[in-house]
């Protein structure tokens, strides 16, 4: 599972007029991390774990970066010709990742009124546009605006993603929080299903990092993929994650089934409660 930093910026227009503010959130490893407080011109940590990641840092450069990015996105929205009456939004999502082999990936996506219309792979400098005619028109608008100073744009995007990766590395290097290992709490529950069957659910919560194996076993052998139902691995708001796996079994055979969990080199098995 790579480490990632994800910037999500949104600007709004009303009746063709671009609004002065912008919304910005930053996610670190999928967790809400920073939010831009527009009134105070400050990037604010989201919750205690985010504060712990950087301790007593002021977030001064994060604040300035987000403010500059918001201004850029407002200018981009001003160049979209498609704006009719009412409320419209332009959203930019930038993601940079550092993988276990130290390779990096950076991408950027633009959405208009919630619809994806332009993506860029920063490494390959390749732009992708969905097939719809609206997306094509919007993409042409934005690409033309960005290409007005093509070299500056190219440099700008490479610098932006270099900054993203630099920030991510700084967070990873400086933070004990991101290097910690928090084992999951595993809880198995059962609920009655139809015709002598029961549904057994295995929940893992409050674990870090995100990588986890959670699967049902019968007589010590993992069940096939299609007989199990998995939940997404989701942030729980405390800098840790949660997930679940469920399967349906015959009543009376509970003792043959166990939930197998593997996380950060540790593993455990958990029986179905009787």
């Amino acid at each position: 599972e790579p480490h990632s930093l994800r910037y999500n910026l949104t600007v709004l227009s009303w009746d063709g007029s671009v609004q002065s503010g912008f919304l910005a959130e930053v996610h670190l490893d999928g967790q809400p991390f920073l939010r831009y407080d527009r009134q105070k011109c400050r990037a604010k940590p989201q919750g205690q774990w985010a504060e712990d990641v950087l301790g007593n840092k002021t977030w001064d450069r994060e604040t300035r970066d987000l403010t500059g990015n918001g201004k850029d996105l407002r200018m981009t929205l001003a160049h979209i010709k498609d704006q009719k009456e009412g409320l419209h939004s332009l959203q930019e999502i930038r993601v940079c990742e550092i993988h276990e082999d130290n390779s990096t990936r950076s991408s950027q996506h633009f959405y208009y009124d919630g619809e994806l219309f332009l993506s860029q792979n920063v490494e390959t400098e390749e732009w992708t546009v969905p097939q719809s005619s609206r997306a094509q028109t919007l993409a042409m608008n934005v690409r033309n605006f960005l290409k007005e100073d093509a070299m500056k744009t190219k440099t700008h995007y490479h610098a932006m993603h270099a900054d993203c990766l630099q920030e991510l590395r700084r967070y990873l290097e400086s933070s004990v929080v991101l290097r910690r290992r928090v084992p999951p709490m595993v809880n198995v529950t059962r609920s009655e299903a139809s015709e002598g069957n029961i549904t057994v659910t295995c929940r893992a919560s409050s674990f870090y990092p995100r990588n986890i194996t959670l699967t049902w076993r019968q007589d010590g052998v993992s069940l096939s993929h299609d007989t199990q139902q998995w939940g997404d691995v989701l942030p729980d708001g405390n800098g840790t994650y949660q997930t679940w796996v469920a399967t349906r079994i015959c009543q009376g055979e509970e003792q043959r089934f166990t939930c197998y969990m593997e996380h950060s080199g540790n593993h455990s098995t958990h029986p179905v409660p009787s």
Epitope: Q39, K40, C41, N56, K57, T58, R61, T67, R170
Partner: antibody, heavy 117, light 107 residues
Framework: QVQLQQSGADLVRPGASVRLSCRAS????????MNWVKQRPGQGLEWIGM????????RLNQKFKDKATLTVDKSSNTAYMQLSSPTSEDSAIYYC??????????WGQGTSVTVSS | DILLTQSPAILSVSPGERVSFSCRAS??????IHWYQQSTNGSPRLLIK???ESISGIPSRFSGSGSGTDFTLTINSVESEDVADYYC?????????FGAGTKLELK
Amino acid sequence: QVQLQQSGADLVRPGASVRLSCRASGYSFTNYWMNWVKQRPGQGLEWIGMIHPSDSETRLNQKFKDKATLTVDKSSNTAYMQLSSPTSEDSAIYYCARDDFFTMDYWGQGTSVTVSS
Amino acid sequence: DILLTQSPAILSVSPGERVSFSCRASQNIVTSIHWYQQSTNGSPRLLIKYASESISGIPSRFSGSGSGTDFTLTINSVESEDVADYYCQQSNIWPLTFGAGTKLELK
């Protein structure tokens, strides 16, 4: 143009608290943090803390947490700093300075505080 | 707290000379350094922000450079009005801190 007008020099008795004022004009007072900075005679600058006039959120240098209290009055565009139980160590010039992304872009003329019995 | 060490304490130069002020941080603060000038009996004035960004209204002879822990403020041709104390300030870590200053004198 941006101006920060600070109150006049103060001679205070040890232990008697003192309140300094900083009146802002020429910009939207509630949109910017206000810093307070201390400078002892012949010495360097020391950051005391900052306050945001919109809701009075404050960030204090821990060294001054029992010494300085920052407040604002939005109706008069004025920031205040109260110094409690002053001693000779608190004799200094105190500046208010407007914050711009953690830099201090406009400064008041300073208020001289002398603590003496 | 971040310690900012300014050197030398006093710089003595002739008008027209190029002069450099040094500021060293006790740990990596990226580019979060700002420079101020304070004339005798005056308030500080912001000269350079974020290591190298110029400030509107400040003469172009003032420039800044550096990142990480070592930073420099340069006046490329000193004028008599530049006689003052010069302070660096960091904004990367709470609390915000200033260097002890360098006094610029004319020979």
